[in-house]
């Protein structure tokens, strides 16, 4: 994922719960991570910007059978407010950048983590 | 290995302003949050408030609230608390602690703690 | 503000001893809780976070369980070391709030 930086409202901004239920869900699959995640699949890099929400959704709703991440594809679905379904692309997604499922997770959580903690200290 | 250093013991007279500053090493220090602590004489612990140091937004205990004022500083990785008023009820241990709110908690690392006098 | 009520105050325990120590939130944390051990002249140490999940080095004698408002903290078989005070912590919501301490002292 890039742009990590330069804090743009990643729209709709989930309530402070639901965003640290997610970032929970994101910590237990990279820390039970035993095989690779998703027998090493991999997804569109996203930009961690307005609407990264229906991005990274977009991205990983192309994974199937993996059910170590079905769980957060349901959460990103709550946080999207439109209909995502596979094959489907916003301009969000980095088209030439295709990074491992387990490092698309790391990447997204590390972005959450910083957006937490900044509706936490606003 | 994640280490806050605090700065050294102070005496203090009553009105006076204190600055304490907490030095953090073996981790970035934008990663996590920074908290502060006060402990009196033989009492129990007491949260102050905290800053976000990649964006300097704060939060606090609203006891405390025109007392402490919280402040980090990313290009020496050193977070500070300035204590203003001073008043012989401020003599007490304090600590700065820090963590990952969701790997260890908000204060899974701590410093070694800043003991303030306040005596006229 | 949530009131966290930590109890008891202080017990005196035996080396071998089962210690069980409680926690109870004015409201539902959530399981966002710590449990911390303080020794006299130094700082706290973190020994669970997540109200049951225990930090890298600690002793596996300590444990934390509970959920919604009422936690524990439990030392399985109290060692010569692990005489010292002990605090919760809620990191549910602003403002973070401690338990008033459990001082566990040698019987």
């Known amino acids: 994922l890039t742009c990590l930086g330069g804090f743009a409202s990643p729209g709709p901004v989930p309530p402070s719960t639901a965003l640290r239920e997610l970032i929970e869900e994101l910590v237990n699959i990279t820390q039970n991570q035993k095989a690779p995640l998703c027998n090493g699949s991999m997804v569109w890099s996203i930009n961690l910007t307005a609407g990264m929400y229906c991005a990274a959704l977009e991205s990983l709703i192309n994974v199937s059978g993996c059910s170590a991440i079905e769980k957060t594809q349901r959460m990103l679905s709550g946080f999207c407010p439109h209909k995502v379904s596979a094959g489907q692309f916003s301009s969000l997604h980095v088209r030439d950048t295709k990074i491992e499922v387990a490092q698309f997770v790391k990447d997204l959580l590390l972005h959450l983590k910083k957006l937490f903690r900044e509706g936490q200290f606003n | 290995e994640v280490q806050l250093v605090q700065s050294g013991a102070e005496v203090k007279k009553p009105g006076a302003t204190v600055k304490i500053s907490c030095k953090v090493s073996?981790?970035?220090?934008?990663?996590?949050?920074m908290h502060w602590v006060q402990q009196a004489p033989g009492k129990g612990l007491e949260w102050i408030g905290g800053?976000?140091?990649?964006?300097?937004?704060?939060a606090s205990n609203q006891k405390f609230k025109g007392k402490a004022t919280l402040t980090a500083d990313k290009s020496t990785d050193t977070a500070y608390m300035e204590l203003s008023s001073l008043r012989s009820e401020d003599t007490a241990v304090y600590y700065c602690t820090s963590g990952d709110y969701f790997g260890g908690g908000p204060f899974a690392y701590w410093g070694q703690g800043t003991l303030v006098t306040v005596s006229s | 503000d949530i009131k966290m009520t930590q109890s008891p105050s202080s017990l005196s325990a035996s080396v071998g001893d089962r210690v069980t120590i409680t926690c109870k939130a004015s409201?539902?944390?959530?399981?966002?809780l710590s449990w911390f051990q303080q020794k006299p002249g130094k700082a706290p140490k973190t020994l669970i976070y997540r109200a049951n999940r225990l930090v890298d080095g600690v002793p596996s004698r300590f444990s934390g369980s509970g959920s919604g408002q009422d936690y524990t903290l439990t030392i399985s078989s109290l060692d010569p070391e692990d005489f010292a005070t002990y605090y919760c912590l809620q990191y549910d919501e602003f403002p973070y709030t401690f338990g008033g301490g459990t001082k566990v002292e040698i019987k």
């Open positions: 409201q539902d944390i959530n399981s966002y």
């Open positions: 800053i976000d140091p990649e964006t300097g937004g704060t």
């Open positions: 073996g981790y970035t220090f934008t990663d996590y949050e």
